[in-house]
Interface confidence: medium
């Protein structure tokens, strides 16, 4: 008979997903854990496997603003939603005193909460009676499984359990409860508790009749094989302890903060002996989607703690570097992307002599106002593009003489190094600057993509030739000091909205990956 | 109890018979393979022997126009007709995404399709549930045989499985499934899968309870005795691996392209131990007649292919210069187009440290066999592309040291000027040659596009670094004198059909206009 034990411990109010280091989630595409994601994985396993228990080994309480505000009500609510089968009391469950445990959690939980080594006395005894139990027998498929709980006997030094709870030695307290389970013909027994890995191992060794130990408190990470994240395993999962009576007892723990879901498969024979055990903690990373209903509930609870433009147009798999540190000093891939979109938006194959009417683009680096980070699942939205191109301009078509273009490129670097906006990004142009030369004579090579050709290739710019160029209306109008364009242009046709040009291109391409490819060089 | 395992792998849509080198059949009297011939041999063995399984180890998808047009429907139809007993998923089964696997194949196959190490998550989990299985127990005569599947964990880098499939380590995933089969009293277990010969051997060594491994992916040819055709055996058939628990586990593979039918006879004892194994791949040459009914069906399906090859895939507004006068002497825009398509076909954004796993392409100019004229309304058809790439090759992924790449570029121009095919076209590479220098020392600049970067840009090639490169299988196998690639490559994964890669890119782009942009220069 095979049992799947899913287990968490030391979740410490990480109800929402977190960064890899279990701090506040910043970059959602790299975030981990959280109850919505945990539920997805638990449900997946419940659907796939017949005999599943979901257990928590304590210390759900304490750790984020969630606990500060909701004081444990959030624990009961979301653990109920996830249909936990049992929980052991951890030391932090007493952080708000016994009342802070009884009211929000013990009275609201729809699952048994356990500890065999906590004994109530005085007036508390009757008040807390039945709200937590030493053990619980759970039906699982056609079998029954006994769960016996324990809590660190150090809790009075670690939390606020008050004077009416006695924390006994774990092993001393557990043995009679296990013996009782045996007399009830329960032959499969899990010790679930919160005393740390060393105590977990001692329980496995010393408590006769315990088949499996599921622990917490020490945030122990166990793993068999190559670990999937940054945690270094303290041993194999499960950690096998040979009991004093010669049995192999698997001991497990699942690190902390809901980053992993412990996954242990146990095979029992007909007499309840463990005949095999294997598994591993499952890293709850972003490859596991967050369950939408739980996520919605989280978002609803979240309020108390604190449409086109947001839709995805396409994806980037590279960082779109629209920073002024790049685009005002050197070729930047955001500039290349925008220029490529501008050319693509102007394909007009009208004549067999010309592959296209225009092949060149120039774009003032200062007009690129923001980068786009690819680490948001690569998503690019209109909102993102509006930050890059916030001025609501157009991308226009002009006709210029080669000599005008040469002047424009000299202007591009006439006061290079001062982070000024006139530094030109390009498409269909290869330019080489020599900054050691005097301003006005720094362009040492200027090759442009032919249009009157069947195979586009680069030829030196001819001063007297007339070229078509796509550029922002801002430049056509002489902006950023490009007076020569305004003064010398031979024709100017206003074009499409800048954001629209780029968004259309991205939608068409679906996935983009512009490079810095040597359009602009310095000799 | 004796079992006959008939097996194929890496058939790559060779539904029709092929030439001896697995390219298009020219002289029918000397052609080999094809499903009609395969069926004849399978039926002959089924009639002669009592306990026969016909298995496929993946990569039926991708390789000829059959796949381009029928998108997997042809695989389901003809594998059903041949009454395959089981198939493992290969990486290429995901080339058209998960939908392209589910609809034509998973939903239509009358045989189980297997993979134990692919786990579905998110919305896909319920959609794909039951359509592929980790294992299947097949009745064979009076016995049962468990078949457990596996797929290369590199699939996310080699194909398009999307984000809702997790490819686990093969051994880690297989063990629990094999254990489950054991608990079901299945004592004869075949691991059928697609991860390459090295992994096949590891599975045989490490996965307790696997009796036989039937593999694919590496196109491994094994043979005992004198081989019957041009393939050189990598070892004896079966290849015997001693498992960690001391069993002798036969491992087999049957080359590729349906040229051979693997034939393995296994003798099991009453406890399901393999006590003997022997066999050999059977060369499906013209001495085996094609089955008339299957052949008639093939001819019926063929009609749609002829129609497809004349339909427009997309348009070019430039002349696609695939002339030998250009591509064997200098950068040609047909070479750029093909390399750009090769990179685009290999976008697998798996890791934030890397914008992509591969950025470089090389392509022997001699492999470009025709230009495409844009003056036919710009139309590009499959027929046009088949003239450019007539050899039915694949565009493969290799790992090479920088020093090997440097040797390859020296070889590219070692006898420059004689119109020889080894002149390399490139993508993600900027190379400068000085032909005045002596052969072997002509590469004066070799810059390559970074992958471990968020903004792709060009850096000098490092001799000791390992790079991934996309190239034709012809080059990976040392063709055109590129012996250094064959001898020094560190990894080789076969890729998609060459024409299919370019046609998909053109269909996606709709309008293309590749330029000669300075990737290859002469100083």
């Amino acid at each position: 008979w095979e049992l799947t034990i899913l287990h968490t411990n030391d979740v410490h109010s990480r109800l929402e997903q977190t960064s890899e280091d279990s701090s506040k989630c910043v970059n959602a595409s790299r975030c981990m854990g959280g109850v919505a994601r945990l539920f997805t994985k638990v449900q997946q396993i419940r659907r796939a496997e017949p005999n599943v228990l979901l257990l928590d080994a304590g210390d759900q309480y304490q750790g984020t603003i969630w606990f500060t505000v909701y004081k444990g009500a959030e624990v009961a609510h979301f653990m109920n939603a996830l249909r936990y089968d049992a929980m052991a009391l951890g030391n932090h469950e007493f952080d708000n005193g016994v009342e802070g445990l009884i009211e929000p959690l013990l009275k609201e939980a729809k699952f048994p909460i356990l500890s065999a080594n906590i004994k109530a006395k005085g007036p508390l005894a009757s008040q807390i009676s039945g709200l937590y139990l030493p053990y619980k027998v759970l039906p699982v498929g056609d079998e029954v499984v006994g769960i016996v709980g324990y809590t660190s006997k150090e809790t009075p030094f670690l939390s606020n359990p008050g004077t009416n709870l006695v924390f006994e030695d774990e092993i001393t307290a557990l043995q009679p409860e296990v013996d009782k389970l045996k007399t009830l013909n329960v032959n499969k027994i899990i010790a679930l508790g919160h005393s740390g890995f060393e105590t977990d191992k001692l329980i496995a060794q010393k408590v006769r009749g315990v088949d499996v130990v599921v622990g917490g408190h020490s945030n122990t990470f166990l793993y068999t094989g190559n670990p999937p994240s940054k945690e270094v395993p303290a041993g194999k999962y499960p950690f096998i302890v040979t009991s004093d009576d010669g049995r192999k007892v698997p001991v497990v723990q699942a690190y902390a903060f809901g980053k992993y879901l412990g996954y242990l498969k146990i095979e029992f024979d007909e007499r309840g002996n463990v005949i095999s055990s294997h598994g591993n903690p499952i890293l709850l990373n972003s490859s596991i989607p967050e369950d939408p209903s739980i996520k919605a509930d989280i978002n609803k609870w979240r309020i108390k703690l604190d449409n086109y433009s947001t839709q995805e147009l396409g994806k980037t798999i590279v960082y779109l570097d629209g920073s002024s540190q790049s685009c005002r000093f050197r070729e930047c891939n955001m500039g290349n992307l925008i220029c490529d979109a501008m050319i693509n938006n102007n394909l007009r194959h009208a004549d067999e002599m010309f592959w296209n009417h225009v092949s060149m683009c120039i774009l003032n680096g200062g007009g690129i106002r923001s980068p786009i980070d690819e680490r948001n699942n690569g998503t690019i939205t209109w909102e993102n593009l509006a930050a890059v191109l916030p001025f609501g301009g157009t991308f226009d078509l002009v006709q210029l003489k080669g000599s005008t273009l040469k002047k424009a490129f000299e202007h591009s670097v006439h006061r290079y190094g001062q982070s000024t906006g006139e530094f030109l990004q390009v498409g269909g142009i290869h330019v080489v600057y020599d900054l050691s030369r005097k301003p006005g004579d720094r362009v040492v090579k200027l090759d442009v993509l032919c249009t009157k050709c069947r195979v586009p290739s680069y030829d030196p710019l001819k001063m007297d030739e007339i070229y078509k160029v796509i550029l922002p209306n801002f430049l056509a109008n002489g902006g950023d000091g490009f007076q020569m364009i305004k003064d010398e242009l031979l024709r100017h046709d206003s074009g499409d909205q800048d954001i629209n040009v780029v968004s259309t291109y991205i939608s068409k391409m679906k996935v983009i990956y512009p490079a810095v490819e040597g359009r602009i060089k310095f000799s | 109890w004796e079992l006959t395992i008939l097996h194929t792998n890496d058939v790559h849509s060779r539904l029709e018979q092929t030439s001896e080198d697995s390219s298009k059949c020219v002289n029918a009297s000397r052609c080999m393979g094809g499903v009609a011939r395969l069926f004849t041999k399978v039926q002959q063995i089924r009639r002669a022997e009592p306990n026969v399984l016909l298995l496929d180890a993946g990569d039926q998808y991708q390789g000829t126009i059959w796949f381009t047009v029928y998108k997997g429907a042809e695989v389901a139809h003809f594998m059903n007709a041949l009454r395959y007993d089981a198939m493992a998923l290969g990486n290429h089964e995901f080339d058209n995404g998960v939908e392209g696997l589910i609809e034509p194949l998973l939903k239509e196959a009358k045989f189980p399709i297997l993979s134990a190490n692919i786990k579905a998550k998110g919305p896909l989990a319920s959609q794909i549930s039951g359509l592929y299985l980790p294992y299947k127990v097949l009745p064979v005569g009076d016995e049962v045989v468990g078949i457990v599947g596996y797929t290369s964990k590199e699939t996310p880098f080699l194909s398009n499985p999307g984000t809702n499939l997790v490819f686990e380590d093969e051994i880690t995933a297989l063990q629990p499934e094999v254990d489950k089969l054991k608990t079901l009293n299945v004592n004869k277990i075949i691991a059928l899968g697609h991860s390459g010969f090295e992994t096949d051997k590891l599975i045989a060594q490490k996965v307790r309870g696997v009796d036989v491994v039937v593999g694919g992916h590496s196109n491994t040819f094994l043979y005992t005795g004198n081989p019957p055709s041009k393939e050189v055996p990598a070892g004896k058939y079966p290849f015997i691996v001693t498992s960690d628990d001391g069993r002798k586990v036969p491992v087999v593979q049957a080359y590729a392209f349906g040229k051979y039918l693997g034939y393995l006879k296994i003798e099991f004892d009453e406890r399901g131990n393999v006590i003997s194994s022997h066999g050999n791949p059977i060369l499906l040459n013209s001495s085996i007649p094609e089955d008339p009914s299957i052949k008639a069906d093939i001819n019926k399906w063929r009609i749609k292919l002829d129609n497809y090859s004349t339909q427009e895939l997309g348009k070019t507004i430039v002349y696609l210069d695939g002339s030998s006068q250009s591509c064997r002497f200098r950068e040609c825009n047909m070479g750029n187009l093909i390399c750009d398509a090769m990179i685009n076909n290999n976008l697998r954004h798996a890791d934030e440290m890397f914008w992509n796993h591969v950025s470089m392409c090389i392509l022997n100019g001699g492999g470009i066999r025709s230009p495409i004229d844009e003056r036919n309304n710009g139309t590009i058809t499959w027929e046009n592309l088949a003239a450019v790439l007539p050899f039915g090759g694949t565009f493969d992924l290799v790992q090479l040291k920088g020093s090997t790449l440097k040797k390859a570029f020296e070889h590219s121009v070692h006898r420059y000027g004689q119109s020889t095919g080894e002149f390399l076209q490139v993508g993600g590479i900027h190379v400068v040659y000085d032909l005045s220098r002596k052969p072997g020392d002509r590469v004066v600049k070799l810059d390559v596009l970074c992958t471990k970067c968020r903004v792709p840009s060009y850096d000098p090639l490092k001799m000791d670094e390992i790079y991934k490169v996309i190239l034709p299988n012809f080059l990976a196998n040392g063709g055109d004198g590129f012996q250094m690639i064959k001898d020094e490559l560190l990894r080789h994964d076969s890729g998609d059909q060459d024409i299919n890669v370019v046609s998909t890119y053109i269909s996606k782009m709709k309008v293309i206009y590749p330029a000669v942009e300075g990737r290859i220069k002469f100083s």
Epitope: - | T224, I240, D245, G246, R247, K248, E267, D269, R271, N273, V274, I275, S276, S277, H278
Partner: antibody, heavy 120, light 106 residues
Framework: EVQLQQSGPELVKPGASVKVSCKAS????????MNWVKQSHGKSLDWIGY????????SYNLTFKGKATLTVDKSSTTAYMHLNSLTSEDSAVYYC?????????????WGQGTLVTVSA | SIVMTPTPKFLLVSAGDRVTITCKAS??????VAWYQQKPGQSPKLLIY???TRYTGVPDRFTGSGYGTDFTFTISTVQAEDLAVYFC????????FGAGTKLELK
């Protein structure tokens, strides 16, 4: 049905040699190693070695290297053991034996044995 | 080479007895152990392989167990036709037989 039929008893003089045959039938001869085992009178069993009929490759117990030579004739599905420089120590019953399978040497099929007596 | 040492060398039995023979390997041989029965004037017969797997047609009163260096062969209820010599054999490294245990009638 698998059968191994050995040649008859041999009486040979010291220093001479002898060739014992083992005719196999009822199975694919080339697919299974043929092993040879010595049993001295009233004693245990000693493995001599095996030959792989497929390719003629052989493996010997070091004790018998130089003493025994194993050969096969695939066309007649017969295995042979040649013993040379015989002494009284070589007097024994010699068995050919085939494994249950071709991996592990579990001898499921045995010849009837050939008695070799070395005597002046 | 690996030495297989059986215990005892002789065993006097009556019909219906339970008989256990052990065989100790001089080093670990995993479970690569077989047991044979040989009657006078006959070739040996394979009874057990892989230490515990009964060969086809062998009655279930014959069982084997063990792993590593210590192996046991048991006849649960001896019958008259079981009187014979029993050999253990390892093929973990090269191939060696034990000296044999002779079952005789009391």
């Amino acid at each position: 049905e698998v059968q191994l039929q050995q040649s008859g008893p041999e009486l040979v003089k010291p220093g001479a040699s002898v060739k014992v045959s083992c005719k196999a039938s009822g199975y694919a001869f080339a697919s299974y190693n043929m092993n040879w085992v010595k049993q001295s009178h009233g004693k245990s069993l000693d493995w001599i070695g095996y030959i792989d009929p497929y390719n003629g490759g052989s493996s010997y117990n070091l004790t018998f290297k130089g003493k025994a030579t194993l050969t096969v004739d695939k066309s007649s599905t017969t295995a042979y053991m040649h013993l040379n420089s015989l002494t009284s120590e070589d007097s024994a019953v010699y068995y050919c034996a085939r494994g249950y399978g071709n991996y592990k040497a579990w001898f499921a099929y045995w010849g009837q044995g050939t008695l070799v007596t070395v005597s002046a | 080479s690996i030495v297989m040492t059986p215990t005892p060398k002789f065993l006097l039995v009556s019909a219906g007895d339970r008989v256990t023979i052990t065989c100790k390997a001089s080093q670990s041989v995993s479970n690569d152990v077989a047991w044979y029965q040989q009657k006078p004037g006959q070739s040996p017969k394979l009874l057990i392989y892989y230490a515990s797997t009964r060969y086809t047609g062998v009655p279930d009163r014959f069982t084997g167990s063990g792993y590593g260096t210590d192996f046991t062969f048991t006849i649960s209820t001896v019958q008259a036709e079981d009187l014979a010599v029993y050999f253990c054999q390892q093929d973990y490294s090269s191939l060696t037989f034990g000296a044999g245990t002779k079952l005789e009638l009391k």
